[in-house]
């Protein structure tokens, strides 16, 4: 029985050239988090494994930093970074929880953070 919920930073925007923190938080479960994947639909960005530590995809090594916590920091943003990002929590014994974040990278200097929302 999966009782947990994932809270994410929701829909967020940031300026081109800037940085952004992608953050998810798993709550309402006592399940043990054994691995967290950060992914786009076509490729994996990073993995934080409880035993192995962090793995950052070579494609992103220059501008992705692990953390804070289980989150991920994207740096030197370009408009091509606009899109959906997913945190995938592998847990025991519950299974897999997924959170979704939509990032919009703006050319202008006006970049507001969206509201937080929950994905069950």
């Amino acid at each position: 029985m999966m009782t947990g919920t994932i809270e994410t930073t929701g829909n967020i925007s940031a300026e081109k050239g800037g940085s952004i923190i992608l953050q998810c938080h798993l709550s309402s479960t006592t399940a043990q988090v054994t691995q967290v994947n950060w992914e786009q639909q076509d490729q994996l960005l990073a993995i934080c494994n409880a035993d192995l530590g962090w793995h950052i995809s070579p494609s992103f090594k220059d501008r992705v930093a692990p953390g804070p916590g289980l989150g991920l920091t994207l740096q030197s943003l370009t408009v091509n970074d606009t899109g959906e990002y997913f945190c995938i929590y592998h847990t025991y014994p519950d299974g897999t929880y997924t959170g979704r974040i939509f990032l919009e990278v703006l050319e202008s200097s006006v970049a507001e953070h969206g509201a937080r929302f929950q994905i069950p």
Epitope: Q35, N37, E39, Q41, D42, Q43, L44, I47, N49, L52, H55, S57, P58, S59, E84, F86, I88, H90, T98
Partner: antibody
Framework: DVQLQESGPGLVKPSQSLSLTCTVT?????????WNWIRQFPGNKLEWMGY???????SYNPSLKSRISITRDTSKNQFFLQLNSVTTEDTATYYC??????????WGQGTTLTVSS | DIVMTQSHEFMSTSLGDRVSITCKAS??????VAWHQQKPGQSPKQLIY???YRYTGVPDRFTGSGSGTDFTFTISNMQAEDLAVYYC?????????FGAGTKLELK
């Protein structure tokens, strides 16, 4: 429970276009997941062809990019494969499969396609 | 493309045996490997994802391990219904790629 069912012509002549349909029941293709086409050649080699995700965007195997198109009809909960300029090398069993982050987790039963004149 | 190499096309086993199938990726894929089972006349079925996580409903005699480039799939107590071809697959990036498969046969 989700079910995927492939349908197609069975036999296609060389240089023609191939069109296959995957009908999905028990899950909306616009809700989540990537909806894949994967083929298995005689001799059992598996090749991922491409997918269309719930939002409608597509990703294709570069080896097929000039010949392939994956589309969908959300009103019928179907997605389609079109492969142009087929040759005998395209003879295979074609599977549609549901997947999450490049992990096909539920496959249809497959449809056999022969390319022959 | 990432090439997935399964060194054994066939492996002989006996019922009750512990059998391990290996797979090697051409580059570091961290833990982004899945294992699929294909029984004769059937479509493939995912058993393991992210190297070691069992898919829903998969018996616990099936386990996966490994990271980086080397991966192992193990059946701890071989049953007759486990006779099948097993494929590794990387889910690190597109294009998805599969190993050539390892067919388990009875001695």
């Amino acid at each position: 429970d989700v079910q995927l069912q492939e349908s197609g012509p069975g036999l296609v002549k060389p240089s023609q276009s191939l069109s296959l349909t995957c009908t999905v029941t028990g899950y909306s293709i616009t809700s989540d997941y990537a909806w894949n086409w994967i083929r298995q050649f005689p001799g059992n080699k598996l090749e991922w062809m491409g997918y269309i995700i719930y939002s409608g965007s597509t990703s294709y195997n570069p080896s097929l990019k000039s010949r392939i198109s994956i589309t969908r009809d959300t009103s019928k909960n179907q997605f389609f494969l079109q492969l142009n300029s087929v040759t005998t090398e395209d003879t295979a069993t074609y599977y549609c499969a549901r997947g999450w982050f490049r992990r096909p987790d539920y496959w249809g039963q497959g449809t056999t396609l022969t390319v022959s004149s | 493309d990432i090439v997935m190499t399964q060194s054994h096309e066939f492996m002989s086993t006996s019922l009750g045996d512990r059998v391990s199938i290996t797979c090697k990726a051409s580059q570091d894929v961290s833990t982004a490997v899945a294992w699929h089972q294909q029984k004769p006349g059937q479509s493939p079925k995912q058993l393991i994802y992210s190297a070691s996580y069992r898919y829903t409903g998969v018996p616990d005699r099936f386990t996966g391990s490994g990271s980086g480039t080397d991966f192992t799939f193990t059946i701890s107590n071989m049953q007759a219904e486990d006779l099948a071809v097993y494929y590794c697959q990387q889910h690190y990036s597109v294009p998805l790629t599969f190993g050539a498969g390892t067919k388990l046969e009875l001695k």
